[in-house]
């Protein structure tokens, strides 16, 4: 693995245990909870990160839905089942045999059912809308400077290919970052937009997943960009299947 050989740590994931027990005595880092070896040169999958994160309160509410099919992570934390690639298994169940289907970012996309519930495939989340509200500043940020800074952040910190950052919208104090990545566009080695969005979300909350790095210090032309509210909407390649009861609630 590419974990730092001298002190055997994982720069991209502090929720690992690293040991010189890889082939030839090389450093190998395994995700907490799952025990899966991770590639420390890139982001760890959200499923493995959620599995590693035993518990913590997580709040997400829907204020405005950008589309009738957009999903918001209202269920918060759970201990997911990950496949051997580290992706979410399409069907997730809790200890009481309540099951539901999830998308590729682990967000529930069906009503809850029992063990007979079938989830035939893991549906890909191809469009993520990150909706941020920044704290009051002396004046509005310059849109093009803000756009450039956020694109740089996703490229350099999260290693997300620039083509997957579809747009950055700004109407003070609201910033919207659109990430788009279809199955056909994602090549081997490309960071998944769901993983990048999760790392960003944790950074924004002051819970960085990076080892030993300082927290996220976002600045636009030297002016601090402090986020006071984050909402993330997920759009799947196939619309979710909820009962009418939920849709009208």
């Amino acid at each position: 693995h590419t974990a730092a050989q001298d002190n055997c740590t994982c720069p991209t994931n502090k929720m690992t245990v690293c040991s010189p027990d890889g082939p030839g005595g090389r450093c190998q880092c395994r995700a907490l909870g799952s025990g899966m070896a991770v590639d420390c040169s890139t982001l760890t999958s959200k499923c493995l990160l959620l599995k590693a994160r035993m518990s913590a309160p997580k709040n997400a509410r829907t204020l405005v839905r950008p589309s009738e099919h957009a999903l918001v992570d209202n269920d918060g934390l759970y201990d997911p089942d990950c496949d051997p690639e580290g992706r979410f298994k399409a069907r997730q169940c809790n200890q009481t045999s309540v099951c539901w289907c999830v998308n590729s970012v682990g967000v529930r996309r069906t009503d809850k059912g029992d063990l007979s519930l079938r989830c035939d495939e893991l549906v890909r989340t191809h469009h993520i809308l990150i909706d941020l509200r920044h704290r009051p500043t002396a004046g509005a940020f310059n849109h093009s400077d803000l756009d450039a800074e956020l694109r740089r952040l996703f490229r350099e910190r999260y290693r997300l290919h620039p083509k997957f950052v579809a747009a950055v919208h700004y109407e003070q104090p609201t910033i919207q970052i659109e990430l788009r990545q279809n199955t056909s566009q994602k090549a081997a080695g490309d960071v998944d937009i769901g993983d990048a969005a999760y790392y960003f979300e944790r950074d924004i909350k002051g819970e960085s997943l990076f080892q030993g790095r300082g927290g996220l210090d976002l600045r636009v032309r030297g002016e601090p960009l402090q986020v006071e509210r984050t909402l993330i909407y997920y759009l799947d390649e196939i619309p979710p299947k909820f009962s009418m009861k939920r849709l009208t609630a």
């Epitope: 693995h1 055997c8 245990v17 040991s19 010189p20 027990d21 890889g22 082939p23 030839g24 005595g25 190998q28 907490l32 909870g33 799952s34 025990g35 899966m36 070896a37 991770v38 590639d39 890139t42 990950c82 496949d83 051997p84 690639e85 580290g86």
Partner: antibody
């Protein structure tokens, strides 16, 4: 050289508890995972769980949760496994092993016999 | 949990013969991050702890005779002994250490005719 030396055989009564030790030498105890494996008479191998002594991270096979408790004492480079509420089906040889791709190091095994 | 299934359960061969035994896992053991298969083969003789023969599906542990070789990827793996010796009589186990809980196959017992 790397060595894992386990405590001697135990004969205990049903319902009792027992604590098996595994003393490590020849390597840095705190930076390798140490696992425990059960082998019932004439049977195959079952992974019980593991511990990372440097940070006391512990993982259990769901089957052994509530049965086995793993601990480690870094000052003596010794790992322990306590087995509780013992029953006849807990009769087995228990091995400790240093885990990892290059870790072919096992203790000699501790035979636990549960008998009234 | 990943289920490991070995075949055959037992086999008897003459000294000098080539022998292969198989191990099938219920899920892929190939880690896409490092392209390594998390599959090991162990040899266990009566009254002894298991001895590591092969790790990473195909890498021979140091000190293991070169008549032992491992192959396969994903879900299907094979241990081959090119020329069986009398001292190879043992039970052979495959093990996955890809994701918790680590699991072993039920074992293949090798005997000499």
């Amino acid at each position: 050289q790397v060595q894992l030396v386990q405590s001697g055989p135990e004969v205990v009564k049903p319902g009792a508890s027992v604590k098996i030790s595994c003393k490590a030498s020849g390597y840095t105890f705190t930076i390798y995972w140490l696992g425990w494996v059960k082998q019932a008479p004439g049977q195959g191998l079952e992974w019980i769980g593991n511990i990372f002594p440097g940070s006391a991270y512990i993982n259990y096979n769901e089957k052994f949760k509530g049965k086995a408790t793993l601990t480690a004492d870094t000052s003596t480079s010794t790992a322990y496994m306590e087995l509780s509420s013992l029953r006849s089906e807990d009769t087995a040889v228990y091995f400790c092993a240093r885990e990892g791709s290059n870790s072919g190091y096992w203790g000699q095994g501790t035979l636990l016999t549960v008998s009234s | 949990d990943i289920v490991m299934t070995q075949s055959p359960d037992s086999l008897a061969v003459s000294a000098g013969e080539r022998v292969t035994m198989n191990c099938k896992s219920s899920q892929s053991l190939l880690n896409s991050g490092n392209q390594q298969n998390y599959l090991a083969w162990y040899q266990q003789k009566p009254g002894q702890p298991p001895k590591l023969l092969i790790y990473g599906a195909s890498t021979r542990e140091s000190g293991v005779p070169d008549r032992f070789s491992g192959s396969g990827s994903g879900t299907d793996f094979t241990l081959t002994i090119s020329s069986v010796q009398a001292e190879d009589v043992a039970v052979y186990y495959c093990q996955s250490d890809h994701i918790y809980p680590y699991t072993f196959g039920q074992g293949t017992k090798l005997e000499i005719k």
